[in-house]
Interface confidence: medium
């Protein structure tokens, strides 16, 4: 069955690479487990950047992806992506699985342009 | 029936003839054995470099490949091809088999062409 | 010749313990999933438990979860069933059975060697 | 667990008769399905695996078909050799389950 998720259409990465957006679903039935994969569309591809169980104990997700941190609370996960280079600029969609108890329900947001800028490199102090 | 398998398009192997890639599978149905075999295309041919399967409990693999190494977490498998040469420029493919329990699936990337370019030999020390 | 050979059955008292064994020759032991299969006297078959190659993935009927373990050993060609906690009901012929993987890009598995059976009887 | 219905339980047949047994699944398994010989006193024995591929050295008399939810097994021609239960077995899902079993005797 399928679940509504809702994710910002456009985020500008920070100088640094860094880009956060929360990704939100609804309806929320009772769910002891969330998984939650943040997956990049290019062209006709779909990758997965990362994915994470949320639990009830387990707010705190993405310990296993060093590029990739997020935390969980209710109907919501603030989704943190760092490392970004301008060549990871693009489409990233969030989708959303409520895996257990049954039933099983899955959602795909319609995705975040990422917007990632190389800071120019610092010139050669004389 | 075939699963997605997605590896970067292309890799500079380091000055020491290192190689690492990513390799990532979805869809991840519940898999308590993946293998993971890396190929090598020339021209027609194909030809194994390495392979291993990993566990829950086993997820540092390639361990009988002196010139392969990797781990794997969740549906992402990093690969770390080492003692590369010039010669060895080529395409290498990612395959996946998720082995058990059945449904059996299988994938296989489109390929990440290894560049390796032999470093320069230092001048000798006068 | 494949051949899988059960052993360790025997009678037992509720609530004691009893470890089967099956010696695997013929084939390529470490090549296969393996699984355990009883039937009661009289009745049909029922599958206890399966392991895979490395003994990375076990799984196990509802009715034996918690109380049967199933290991192997690939340098002794060998699989194993730990029984505790036994009970009137867990009373069998124990086969251990070959699971043979088919088909190319879709897996299928069946049973297709079987071991002769022990009889694990659990009586006070 | 997906639940296996066999039927009928037990059926008497001449020899030369063709045989037929049914095995219902209580959900979808595709094609996931295997059919066993059992013989009194012995182990099963593979006859059918993924619905219809006989087992090498099965004799041909032997077949299966079916998909989803609906099987059949059939005997084309039995034979004295064929007194036997016959049972299925869905390997769509763990716990892996089997069909209650038919037993087949000779008029």
């Known amino acids: 069955e399928a679940i509504q998720v809702t994710q910002p259409s456009v985020v500008l990465a920070s100088s640094h690479g860094v880009a956060s957006f929360p990704c939100e679903y609804s309806p929320s039935h009772n769910t002891d487990e969330v998984r939650v994969t943040v997956l990049r569309q290019t062209n006709d591809q779909m990758t997965e950047v990362c994915a994470t169980t949320f639990t009830e104990k387990n707010t705190v997700g993405f310990l296993d992806y060093p590029f990739c941190s997020g935390t969980f609370n209710e109907s919501r996960v603030n989704l943190t992506i760092q490392g970004l280079r301008a060549v990871d600029t693009g489409l990233y969609l969030c989708k959303v699985e409520l895996m257990y108890p049954p039933p099983y329900f899955v959602g795909m947001g319609n995705g975040t342009q990422i917007y990632v800028i190389d800071p120019e490199p610092c010139p050669d102090s004389d | 029936e075939a699963i997605q398998v997605t590896q970067p398009s292309v890799v500079l192997a380091s000055s020491h003839g290192v190689a690492s890639f990513p390799c990532e599978y979805s869809p991840s149905h519940n898999t308590d054995e993946v293998r993971v075999t890396v190929l090598r295309q020339t021209n027609d041919q194909m030809t194994e470099v390495c392979a291993t399967t990993f566990t829950e409990k086993n997820t540092v693999g390639f361990l009988d490949y002196p010139f392969c190494s990797g781990t794997f977490n969740e549906s992402r498998v990093n690969l770390t091809i080492q003692g590369l040469r010039a010669v060895d420029t080529g395409l290498y493919l990612c395959k996946v088999e998720l082995m058990y329990p059945p449904p059996y699936f299988v994938g296989m990337g489109n390929g990440t062409q290894i560049y390796v370019i032999d470093p320069e030999p230092c001048p000798d020390s006068d | 010749e494949v051949q899988l050979v059960e052993s360790g059955g025997g009678l037992v008292q509720p609530g004691g313990s009893l470890r089967l064994s099956c010696a695997a020759s013929g084939f390529t032991f470490s090549s296969y999933v393996m699984h355990w299969v009883r039937q009661a006297p009289g009745k049909g078959l029922e599958w206890v438990s399966a392991?895979?190659?490395?003994?990375?993935?076990?799984y196990y009927a509802d009715s034996v979860k918690g109380r049967f373990t199933i290991s192997r050993d690939n340098s002794k060609n060998t699989l194993y069933l730990q029984m505790n906690s036994l009970r009137a009901e867990d009373t069998a012929v124990y086969y251990c059975?070959?699971?043979?993987?088919?088909?190319?890009?879709?897996?299928?598995?069946?049973?297709?060697?079987w071991g002769q059976g022990t009889l694990v009887t659990v009586s006070s | 667990d997906i639940q296996m219905t066999q039927s009928p339980s037990s059926l008497s047949a001449s020899v030369g008769d063709r045989v037929t047994i049914t095995c219902q699944a209580s959900?979808?398994?595709?094609?996931?399905l295997n059919w066993y010989q059992q013989k009194p006193g012995k182990a099963p024995k593979l006859l059918i695996y993924?619905?219809?591929n006989l087992e090498t050295g099965v004799p041909s008399r032997f077949s299966g078909s079916g998909s989803g939810t609906d099987f059949t097994f059939t005997i084309s021609s039995l034979q004295p050799e064929d007194i036997a239960t016959y049972y299925c077995?869905?390997?769509?899902?763990?716990?892996?389950?089997f069909g209650q079993g038919t037993k087949v005797e000779i008029k």
């Open positions: 059975a070959r699971g043979r993987l088919f088909g190319l890009v879709r897996y299928g598995e069946a049973f297709d060697v």
């Open positions: 392991i895979t190659w490395s003994g990375g993935g076990t």
């Open positions: 959900k979808d398994i595709s094609n996931y």
């Open positions: 077995q869905q390997f769509n899902s763990f716990p892996l389950t």
């Open positions: 993924d619905a219809s």
